[in-house]
């Protein structure tokens, strides 16, 4: 049997196989050792007994999408049946005091591979034997502690495979320079040691994406905005836009990145090299925000220019290639590929990323201030608490709710939170009355809210003993 017979139904075309060569990976035309690594179809009854105490689940994740040319990393994590875990020696043991359907186990081991390897590896001193090999016959790499690695992972994509010996979790990184753009399928088959052979325990597949567009995400933050995720913001307060580029392999670390903003409010284009920008909308309404990110990234080099003819001027070293037709497999792009030849063959290509959002601008509470505090004289007998009136003003829209958070003088340990609806006139002047149990210094956070905004002000106040002669003081 060949690898492609074992590992997957997806058969890439000859073109794909030729153009998607992954560094360090092998062709799935190679032979598979079915004697050491038995192959079971889905639904085969033997899967039921491939692992003691239940089924092992493999979870495959990746940091996709990957910008073409960058590395994409795949991670496989094995999830064992309840009460089982891998110990420091790579053996599978029962967790202490953990009860599963079978109850508490007397034997601490599910699989004691250390014992197996000591029994079965009676080979010469090299530690190599005919069964310490991968499905294609290549010997296991002898890293320090390799004997504690009891799982064999076979990754398969684009007509190629990669074998790895590991523990209950492994990571594999692949460079995408030669990978066709678009969604691709990664399949992983996992085997465990079983004496002098191996047993399949899990299969998993996941789609990953290779793109020529820089993956871009923008976070938006605005002071007083009640819900930052609803893309509704407040008029007359700056919004901070922060661009996050998904580049887990740091492919663009040495690239100059330009950000071109259009805020949709007729303020023109704004170009910056900073990933954060502030913008204030001065009108209510709905606006279309557009961002284009441009980065010069390592890329393929253009063919060398033809030798110059004496009668013509020397052509420029920078050459622009038209992008491939979008139906043609191969690294493609929306924009013409702008390539610049550099003498040492390290060429650069301009990559672009786009972000678009529709944001709504509404009135909101812009500012809140405590302008006066008064100790309300209460009739006796109530000596242990004080009533304080906070006279508050605000700017912007009319608040519908007031919250006070009373805490210790460091403003860290909350003692009391009270929220209540308020009716405020257009002058936005209101009095908030709160009870303070006992004298001392308090931190008061006062927020006024409406449907879309939440404005905060804080003050430290000193509540005196209930001696009418001692005045209320703002401690700050």
């Amino acid at each position: 049997k060949r690898f492609h017979d074992v590992l997957g139904n997806e058969r890439p075309s000859a073109y794909m196989r030729e153009h998607n060569q992954l560094n360090g990976w092998s062709s799935d035309e190679n032979d598979w050792n079915e004697k050491l690594y038995p192959v079971w179809k889905r639904g085969d009854m033997r899967w039921k007994n491939s692992w003691k105490g239940g089924r092992v689940q493999a979870v495959l994740t990746s940091d996709s999408p990957a910008l073409v040319g960058s590395n994409i990393t795949f991670a496989v994590n094995l999830i064992f049946p309840r009460c089982q875990k891998e110990d420091a020696n790579g053996n599978i043991v029962y967790e202490k005091n953990c009860r599963n359907e079978a109850g508490l186990s007397a034997d601490p081991y599910v699989y004691n591979w250390t014992a197996w390897s000591e029994d079965s590896d009676g080979e010469n001193g090299t530690g190599q034997s005919h069964h310490n090999v991968f499905p294609d016959g290549k010997p296991f790499p002898h890293h320090p502690g390799w004997r504690r690695w009891n799982f064999i992972y076979v990754f398969h994509t684009l007509g190629q495979y990669f074998q790895k010996l590991g523990r209950c979790s492994v990571r594999v990184s692949v460079n995408t320079a030669n990978v066709t753009l678009g969604p691709q399928l990664m399949e992983v088959t996992v085997y465990r040691r079983h004496g002098r052979a191996y047993v399949p325990i899990a299969q998993v597949k996941d789609v990953y994406v290779v793109t020529d567009q820089i993956p871009v995400f923008v976070t938006m933050f605005q002071k007083n905005d009640r819900n930052s995720s609803d893309e509704t913001f407040l008029k007359d307060l700056p919004i901070m836009f922060d661009v996050l580029i998904h580049d887990p392999s740091h492919f663009l670390n040495y690239s100059t990145i330009n950000y071109k903003w259009s805020f949709g409010d007729n303020t023109g284009l704004f170009v910056s090299t900073n990933h954060t920008v502030n913008h204030t909308y001065v009108l209510n309404g709905t606006f279309s925000l557009n961002l284009t990110v441009k980065a010069a990234a390592p890329g393929p080099c253009p063919p060398p220019p033809p030798p110059p003819r004496p009668s013509k001027p020397t052509p420029s070293l920078a050459t622009t290639l038209k992008s491939y037709d979008s139906n043609t497999p191969g690294p493609a792009g929306d924009n013409p590929l702008e390539l610049s030849r550099i003498p040492d063959e390290n060429c650069q290509i301009n990559r672009y990323g786009h972000f678009q959002a529709t944001i709504t601008i509404v009135e909101g509470i812009l500012e809140v201030n405590i302008i006066q505090m008064t100790d309300v004289l209460m009739p006796v007998p109530w000596p242990e608490s004080s009533l304080i009136d906070f006279v508050v003003t605000c700017q912007g829209s009319i608040p519908t709710e007031v919250c006070t958070i009373i805490s210790d003088p460091t403003c860290e340990i909350t003692q009391n939170t009270v929220c209540s609806p308020v009716d405020v006139d257009e002058m936005c002047l209101l009095t908030v009355r709160r009870t303070f149990n006992g004298s001392g210094t308090y931190c008061v956070n006062l927020t006024l809210g409406d449907d879309t905004s939440l404005a905060l002000t804080s003050t430290l106040i000193s509540v005196p003993d209930r001696d009418p002669a001692s005045p209320l003081r703002m401690a700050n």
Partner: antibody, heavy 116, light 110 residues
Framework: EVQLLESGGGLVQPGGSLRLSCAAS????????MSWVRQAPGKGLEWVSS????????YYADSVKGRFTISRDNSKNTLYLQMNSLRAEDTAVYYC?????????WGQGTLVTVSS | QSVLTQPPSASGTPGQRVTISCSGS????????VSWYQQLPGTAPKLLIY???QRPSGVPDRFSGSKSGTSASLAISGLRSEDEADYYC???????????FGGGTKLTVL
């Protein structure tokens, strides 16, 4: 002069629905929060629901949550209370009231009777 | 059972001073403003006191409100026959997220 005029009350069977309206005049309706309060025959006052001036914030008494919906149409200066799955204990005079931290003006009320 | 507790009835003779109490907790009276409402027989309620002790315009100064801790009081001095009505206290309850009323006090002018 502030005026609140409720309408839409009447006799309805248990499980039935009714929609109350409150027409407001004499003040800038779109700038004020509004509420509904009810009073069962011979009993005390019970707050039912409140809505903010823009309609974005709504509060309900536990006894009506999930059955009643408060809404408003600021262009028509009208407050509504949609009452579904009505029960015998919802029988009351329903008052429309201005504001929600204190009720400074009240309508004359509309009687809702839930009976088979 | 009302969240705010009022005496079911109170009485007084004309010219006398009568006080109606309203007891609650820190989540309502203790940290929120108290209002008092008057309901004359067969009519809609009317606001009498707001923000613990403030009188709306048109309410005679014979009516006064006060608050101490988690209790509030309505005092009516110079009692008149037209003051015979039901009186309700009310406040927002920050724990229940609801406006709560007292059970009401029926005032009789003897």
């Amino acid at each position: 002069e502030v005026q609140l005029l409720e309408s839409g009350g009447g006799l309805v069977q248990p499980g039935g629905s009714l929609r109350l309206s409150c027409a407001a005049s004499g003040f800038t309706f779109r700038k004020l929060n509004m509420s509904w309060v009810r009073q069962a025959p011979g009993k005390g006052l019970e707050w039912v629901s409140s809505i903010s001036h823009s309609g974005g914030s709504k509060y309900y008494a536990d006894s009506v949550k999930g059955r009643f919906t408060i809404s408003r149409d600021n262009s028509k200066n009208t407050l509504y209370l949609q009452m579904n799955s009505l029960r015998a204990e919802d029988t009351a005079v329903y008052y429309c009231a201005r504001k929600w931290s204190t009720f400074d003006y009240w309508g004359q009320g509309t009687l809702v009777t839930v009976s088979s | 059972q009302s969240v705010l507790t009022q005496p079911p009835s109170a009485s007084g003779t004309p010219g006398q001073r009568v006080t109606i109490s309203c007891s609650g907790s820190s989540s309502n009276i203790g940290n929120n403003y108290v209002s008092w409402y008057q309901q004359l027989p067969g009519t809609a309620p009317k606001l009498l006191i707001y923000a613990d002790s403030q009188r709306p315009s048109g309410v005679p100064d014979r009516f006064s409100g006060s608050k101490s801790g988690t209790s509030a009081s309505l005092a009516i001095s110079g009692l008149r026959s037209e003051d015979e009505a039901d009186y309700y206290c009310g406040a927002w309850d920050s724990s229940l997220n609801a406006y709560v009323f007292g059970g009401g006090t029926k005032l009789t002018v003897l």
